[in-house]
Amino acid sequence: EVEKTACPSGKKAREIDESLIFYKKWELEACVDAALLATQMDRVNAIPFTYEQLDVLKHKLDELYPQGYPESVIQHLGYLFLKMSPEDIRKWNVTSLETLKALLEVNKGHEMSPQVATLIDRFVKGRGQLDKDTLDTLTAFYPGYLCSLSPEELSSVPPSSIWAVRPQDLDTCDPRQLDVLYPKARLAFQNMNGSEYFVKIQSFLGGAPTEDLKALSQQNVSMDLATFMKLRTDAVLPLTVAEVQKLLGPHVEGLKAEERHRPVRDWILRQRQDDLDTLGLGLQGGIPNGYLVLDLSMQEALS
């Protein structure tokens, strides 16, 4: 091991304060006691250390805690968190939501870094499930967080946590993710009345099955076209023209503009043309009058 340079007389750091910004890297290494640094981590953030100086401070903590930092230190890492690697973070055991918030604050306004992703992963795994407070926090910092999770990971979200989800949090979710989230949302909002229920469930409807869409069509919900376009194609296809008209209400006129796009295009292909004509929108491509429609899926089920 390389022999360490001794701290010059009178230069030993007795507290973590602004005088340390004038210390050279070797002086920080020689004169700052790691235990002192650990107990006064909350002061580091207020001191304009250079990146090189922060490297030295990180090295001192790494030496003191080779198995991973304790939470008392992690909570006060501040900008030193940006120096941590995912490998460092995997050694941590973060259980406090306050610690998580403190570290997410450091990275605020930036894309989710590998460090942050690892931190969140460690935190959620430590908790065992994605509870409401955690979800609240994560989606506040990263609106797209929920949609970055796999369907398997989303399955650990308790229905109670769904209350924390805002519409924009689901913007980038794909149908597989909404398939997992929708039943949870349905459960979470089940005691709400019709119009309030629809407002809450609306952003999750990309995971709704046909029977739920049929039920909604009986409730005068006036679904907007943007929501309709995000519905599962397989859930929309069995809906009748009358059901779609009731589901969309005054927004039904918007179907014309979307007739070449899924799921509207595929739905039109499944409807009788004379049923489509009743809408008076000039929708074309339905099944001509007199044609017999065979539901092959039904036939397969019977055989």
């Epitope: 030993k12 007795r14 006691d33």
Partner: antibody, heavy 118, light 109 residues
């Protein structure tokens, strides 16, 4: 509250070794950033810094007295001991122990007068 | 040897302002913070100013400290009879670890 108290012989003979004990309460010498020092003051004269022992057992001594001084601590007993060899009448002084927290001597003992005389 | 130089004595009438100077070098005051201690007759010293100009709780704001280059000074405004005491400046030192000034006796006339 934080308190420090010096104890030791009031009279020592020239060439003898002085042993002083500082017993403290209200803080721990294993807490980061904390240390205990010895400072002396000859009658009617200025304060003179002697030695310091820190939370991490780091020891510092006055350059001019380095060869004669030894400082040690017993954290479990909350005590710091200073020994000073080869005492001389010019070492007659009130000896204070003081806690240093951060950069400052924030609490002092009442002092103990040591007279060196044959 | 006294490393920090202070005037042996200063005096002032009640209500007046007095200053006590403390001169050092780049190895102490020039590169480190200055503290001031007050020693009332027959008692142990008491921390009066730390970090050049900060007051511990309980110290009246009549006491203030400043530092410039390798010198420091203590100012006392609205002088009171109970301020009569010895005042010591001190600093960490790159050569001597920690040093005190020779002390200044303040007399309130």
């Amino acid at each position: 509250q934080v308190q420090l108290k010096e104890s030791g012989p009031a009279l020592v003979k020239p060439t003898q070794t002085l042993t002083l004990t500082c017993t403290f309460s209200g803080f721990s010498l294993s807490s980061s950033g904390v240390g205990v020092s010895w400072i002396r003051q000859p009658p009617g004269k200025a304060l003179e810094w002697l030695a310091l022992i820190d939370w991490d057992d780091d020891k510092s001594y006055s350059t001019s007295l380095k060869t004669r001084l030894t400082i040690s601590k017993d954290t479990s007993k909350n005590q710091v001991v200073l020994t000073m060899t080869n005492m001389d009448p010019v070492d007659t002084a009130t000896y204070y122990c003081a806690r240093i927290q951060g950069w400052n001597y924030d609490v002092w003992g009442q002092g103990t007068l040591v007279t060196v005389s044959s | 040897d006294i490393v920090l130089t202070q005037p042996p004595s200063v005096s002032g009438a009640p209500g007046q302002r007095v200053t006590i100077s403390c001169s050092g070098s780049s190895s102490n005051i020039g590169n480190n913070r200055v503290s001031w201690y007050q020693q009332l007759p027959g008692t142990a010293p008491k921390l009066l100013i730390y970090g050049n100009n900060k007051r511990p709780s309980g110290v009246p704001d009549r006491f203030s400290g400043s530092k410039s280059g390798t010198s420091a000074s203590l100012a006392i405004t609205g002088l009171q009879s109970e301020d009569e005491a010895d005042y010591y400046c001190s600093a960490w030192d790159l050569l001597e670890v920690y040093v005190f000034g020779g002390g200044t006796k303040l007399t309130v006339l």
